[in-house]
Interface confidence: medium
């Protein structure tokens, strides 16, 4: 029987099944000391673990969510560009969200996140899953910032509904403010969706990456008197 270090909760791990199979694999490797499994077999086990974790990641539908992420980012980008065109043509004040330009740099980040998620869904390598996870965590933080920015923006900008034609506008000032507030609201909604998708993809990415056995596995052979002789075997990533 074995004891091993877990990197995630038992119910999230495929180690149990994989480690059980290791009992049948224990063979004496010449000169390696008793009770030590062959390194070749360890690599096979690790490959088997990664396969299971790959499946966990793919359960999160990274390709579908990545496409949705890109579509939302493109919608947000088009909203932002439209808002900028409407706002800058008006002689007066415009929403903070336009001034900060979140819709531009936020959308670029979400497009990168989505692209990495799609790539990780097509070719599930650790590098791509890691990249996707990193970008989606960043996107989650950005989406939270965007939600805050847009909420403040809407609150402040609604104040100008009272004052808007103080500065005047060749078109109906209140109409312009209403359009900008509506679009700001839409960007807020899209930011909430982006946050949900980024968090979801991060969660599935984390299940795959954070649960990878990158630590030390302690093999304890069945004959307990030999326990002291069993070395600590690191499981190298493949």
């Amino acid at each position: 029987h074995q004891t091993y270090r877990r990197h995630c909760r038992p119910e999230e791990s495929t180690f149990s099944a994989a480690m059980t199979t290791m009992q049948g694999m224990e063979q004496a490797t010449p000169g390696a000391g008793p009770g030590v499994p062959q390194l070749g077999n360890m690599a096979v086990v690790h490959s088997h673990l990664w396969k299971g974790l790959q499946e966990k990641f793919l359960k999160g539908e990274p390709k579908v969510l990545g496409v949705v992420q890109i579509l939302i980012a493109l919608m947000s980008l088009s909203m932002g560009i439209t808002m900028m065109c409407v706002a800058f043509s008006a002689y007066g004040h415009y929403p903070i969200s336009v001034y900060i330009g979140y819709t531009i740099w936020g959308s670029v980040m979400f497009i990168i996140s989505g692209s990495l998620s799609i790539a990780a869904g097509i070719r599930t390598t650790k590098g791509l899953v890691r990249g996707s996870l990193g970008m989606n965590i960043t996107s989650s933080v950005l989406a939270v910032s965007a939600i805050l920015i847009n909420t403040i923006s809407l609150t402040i900008y609604s104040f100008y509904h009272r004052y808007c034609n103080y500065y005047g506008n060749p078109n109906n000032c209140h109409g312009t403010v209403s359009i900008l507030m509506g679009m700001d609201g839409m960007v807020l909604l899209l930011s909430v969706l982006e946050f949900c998708i980024a968090v979801s993809l991060s969660a599935f990415g984390c299940k795959a990456i954070c649960c990878t056995p990158g630590g030390v596995v302690l093999i304890i052979p069945s004959n307990s008197h030999m326990a002291e002789a069993a070395p600590l075997t690191p499981l190298n990533e493949v």
């Epitope: 004040h93 034609n165 500065y167 005047g168 109906n172 209140h174």
Partner: antibody, heavy 114, light 112 residues
Framework: QIQLVQSGPELKKPGETVKISCKAS????????LSWVKQTPGKGLKWMGW????????TYANDFKGRFAFSLETSASTTYLRINNLKNDDTATYFC???????WGQGTPLTVSS | DVVMTQTPFTLSVTIGQSASISCKSS???????????LSWLLQRPGQSPKRLIY???KLDSGVPDRFTGSGSGTDFTLKISRVEAEDLGVYYC?????????FGGGTKLEIK
């Protein structure tokens, strides 16, 4: 072309009420707020406040709260300045102007004298 | 309210000479939308004021390019490169950054 045309000169006694009009033309009336500016003889310009021509909400400068009232007649593209309980120091020329001070009325001289 | 301080009070120039008027505000006139709401107006004798410059340096239509506005934050200047007889009158700076706009005290331009 854009024009702001004000009502003619006024001569009033202290304690009376005056209503000065400012008729706008040449642009969409509800798209630009209108300000009222007071100029006493030989003195500078003093902003009295403005009215949102879309919502009709007036905003008054601190020195012009109480006896002063701005109102609208949107259908006639006209804004009004009403001064109640006139005092001698209300004697001045009153201008209406678009809030960005880009267009001005010709001014309405008001004389308050007993 | 924002206080606008104009200097000098009176400016005497000969025709063809240049003239410069300064305007200082008690707080920055740069708004969060990136625009600086400062205008220059001219009130000729017996007339209503006329806006010459808006957003610090933009000339209103029909205003000769002899007039130039400059400055940022709290310090602004109006320059008239070659003064003409029609330029005499009182010049005012105006701020519209808050919803209680204010005017400078005025600078009277006289012809020597």
């Amino acid at each position: 072309q854009i024009q702001l045309v004000q009502s003619g000169p006024e001569l009033k006694k202290p304690g009376e009420t005056v209503k000065i009009s400012c008729k706008a033309s040449g642009y969409i009336f509800t798209s630009y707020g209108l300000s009222w500016v007071k100029q006493t003889p030989g003195k500078g310009l003093k902003w009295m406040g403005w009215i949102n021509t879309y919502s009709g909400v007036p905003t008054y400068a601190n020195d012009f709260k109480g006896r002063f009232a701005f109102s609208l007649e949107t259908s006639a593209s006209t804004t009004y300045l009403r001064i109640n309980n006139l005092k001698n120091d209300d004697t001045a020329t009153y201008f209406c102007a678009r809030s960005l001070v880009d267009y001005w009325g010709q001014g309405t001289p008001l004389t308050v004298s007993s | 309210d924002v206080v606008m301080t104009q200097t000098p009070f009176t400016l005497s120039v000969t025709i063809g000479q240049s003239a410069s008027i300064s305007c200082k505000s008690s707080q920055s006139l740069l708004y969060s939308d990136g625009k600086t709401y400062l205008s220059w107006l001219l009130q000729r004798p017996g007339q209503s004021p006329k806006r010459l410059i808006y957003l610090v340096s933009k000339l209103d239509s029909g205003v000769p390019d002899r007039f130039t506005g400059s400055g940022s934050g709290t310090d602004f200047t109006l320059k008239i490169s070659r003064v003409e007889a029609e330029d005499l009158g009182v010049y005012y700076c105006w701020q519209g950054i808050d919803f209680h706009q204010t005017f400078g005290g005025g600078t009277k331009l006289e012809i020597k």
